[in-house]
Amino acid sequence: HTAAQDNCTCPTNKMTVCSPDGPGGRCQCRALGSGMAVDCSTLTSKCLLLKARMSAPKNARTLVRPSEHALVDNDGLYDPDCDPEGRFKARQCNQTSVCWCVNSVGVRRTDKGDLSLRCDELVRTHHILIDLRHRPTAGAFNHSDLDAELRRLFRERYRLHPKFVAAVHYEQPTIQIELRQNTSQKAAGDVDIGDAAYYFERDIKGESLFQGRGGLDLRVRGEPLQVERTLIYYLDEIPPKFSMKRLT
C-alpha cells in the first residue's frame, strides 16, 4: 500500500510489522499481538491497538500508563479479545477467568463475573464526549475558528467525516467535542468514532500511534492549543448494567 511503498511501513499504525508479501509484492502490514492484517489508509481498530500495546515488550512501553484522568475507562489497560474484523468481543475475560461485558470502545459496562457471564451483543457506543482543558493563553480562542480547526483535524488526521462531529462547545478554558454515530449512520469507509477518539486521546498524551508523523500540533489561527487535561465520557445505545453496590 502506498505511503510506504519504498520502505514498507504503516503510516496510520506504528505497532505493526510490515513486509512486501501482499499481492503483486505490495506492502502488507499486520498488527502486533494479533497478527491481523490492517488497512494502513485508515485508523486501526482500538481493540487491535490495545492488543498490540499489551504485547509490546515492557521496555518498549515507556509511555504506557493508565490515565490518571480517566473517569469511565477506569479499569486501565487489558489484553482484549478481538473478533475477526478487529472489533471488541462483547465478553472479555482475564487469565483468572474473571469476565465482564464491554461496549464497542472496549470499556466495561457490567459488573465483573465468572465464565458463566453472558454478553449477548456488543453494545454500541454512539456518543462520545471529549472534555479538554487547555493551558492559559493570552485570550480566549474564537469559538468558530476552534470549531473549524477541530473538524479539520478530525477529518484530515483521523479521517472522521465532519458529520460525526456533532458539536464543539467552548467555555474558556474548557473545550468539549461531541462525537455521535449510530450504527445505521456509518457508510462504507467511515471511521468509527471510538477509534478516532482513541487516536486523539493518544495524540493528546504525546503517544501518537502514527508512523513517522510528527506529534499533534494543534493551532487555532496560529496560536498553539495545548491541552493539560482530558476526560472522555462514553454513552452507549443501551445503558450499562452495574449493580447498585457499585453505584454507591
Epitope: 500500500h1 502506498t2 505511503a3 511503498q5 503510516p11 489508509s41 485508515t42 473538524r151 479539520r152 477529518r155 484530515e156 479521517r159 467525516h161 465532519p162 458529520k163 449510530n182 445505521s184 449512520q185 456509518k186 457508510a187 462504507a188 469507509g189 467511515d190 471511521v191
Partner: antibody
Framework: QVQLVQSGAEVKKPGASVKVSCKAS????????MHWVRQAPGQGLEWMGE????????SYNQKFKGRVTITRDTSTSTAYMELSSLRSEDTAVYYC????????????WGQGTLVTVSS | DIQMTQSPSSLSASVGDRVTITCRAS??????LNWYQQKPGKAPKLLIY???RLHSGVPSRFSGSGSGTDFTLTISSLQPEDFATYFC??????????FGQGTKLEIK
C-alpha cells in the same frame, strides 16, 4: 452489479429549477455516500455535494450558495439533486457517483444528465 | 479549498509508449489521491484510489505513486483504448473535494 441510472436530459430557462434523479441498484443504497459532480461542456469536473442516504445528512460546495439541494428516497433507492436559480453557466452534464467514506473516491458513476439552460 | 494542478494538459503518444501524468496538490494531502479516466460522451471511471490502489477490473499497466503534494499516474504500455482524458481528485480535506483540470491523452 452496481448501477446508477439517471433521468433524461432537460432544457430549462434562466431562473428556473431542475431536479435530476439517480436510481441505484446492485448494492445497499444506505451503505454508501452519494455525491453529485458536474461537468460544463469541454471543462473539468466540479464536486457539488454529498448525501448519506441512511440519515439524510448532506453537505454542499459553498460555491453554489444554497442553490443546490440533495435529497433521497430510500424506498426507491433514488437520490435527487435540485439546482435552482439556473443561469446559462449551469449548462453542464450532471453526474451522481457512489463514494467511499475514507478515500472519498467515486467508484461508480451514473451515465450523466445534460441540463441546458437557455432563454 | 485545495487546488489540484495536472501536467501536461495534453500529450500525444503512440501505442506501446510509457506515459506519465503528474498531479500536484496545493497542500499536503497524504495519500488521498484518486485517478479517473473519461472518454468523450461517457462518465468518468475510477482507475486508482488512495494513490496506488487499482480499482477492480483496471488493467495492471496502470499504476500510481506519490505522497504529500506530488503524484503520478503511469501507463506502462499504452493500448488503443487508453486514449482518453485523465483527472486526479483529492479526498483528503473537508469538502469541497477537488479535481485537477484534466490531461488529454491523444494518439500521435
Amino acid at each position: 452489479q452496481v448501477q446508477l441510472v439517471q433521468s433524461g436530459a432537460e432544457v430549462k430557462k434562466p431562473g428556473a429549477s431542475v431536479k435530476v434523479s439517480c436510481k441505484a441498484s446492485g448494492y445497499t443504497f444506505t451503505s454508501y455516500w452519494m455525491h453529485w459532480v458536474r461537468q460544463a461542456p469541454g471543462q473539468g469536473l466540479e464536486w457539488m455535494g454529498e448525501i448519506t442516504p441512511s440519515d439524510n445528512y448532506t453537505s454542499y460546495n459553498q460555491k453554489f450558495k444554497g442553490r443546490v439541494t440533495i435529497t433521497r428516497d430510500t424506498s426507491t433507492s433514488t437520490a435527487y439533486m435540485e439546482l435552482s436559480s439556473l443561469r446559462s453557466e449551469d449548462t453542464a452534464v450532471y453526474y451522481c457517483a457512489r463514494g467511499h467514506g475514507n478515500y472519498v473516491s467515486f467508484d461508480y458513476w451514473g451515465q450523466g444528465t445534460l441540463v441546458t439552460v437557455s432563454s | 479549498d485545495i487546488q489540484m494542478t495536472q501536467s501536461p494538459s495534453s500529450l500525444s503518444a503512440s501505442v506501446g509508449d510509457r506515459v506519465t501524468i503528474t498531479c500536484r496538490a496545493s497542500q499536503d494531502i497524504s495519500n488521498y489521491l484518486n485517478w479517473y479516466q473519461q472518454k468523450p460522451g461517457k462518465a468518468p471511471k475510477l482507475l486508482i484510489y488512495y494513490t496506488s490502489r487499482l480499482h477492480s477490473g483496471v488493467p495492471s499497466r496502470f499504476s500510481g505513486s506519490g505522497s504529500g503534494t506530488d503524484f503520478t499516474l503511469t501507463i506502462s504500455s499504452l493500448q488503443p483504448e487508453d486514449f482518453a482524458t485523465y483527472f486526479c481528485q483529492q479526498g483528503y480535506s473537508l469538502p469541497p473535494y477537488t479535481f485537477g483540470q484534466g490531461t488529454k491523452l491523444e494518439i500521435k
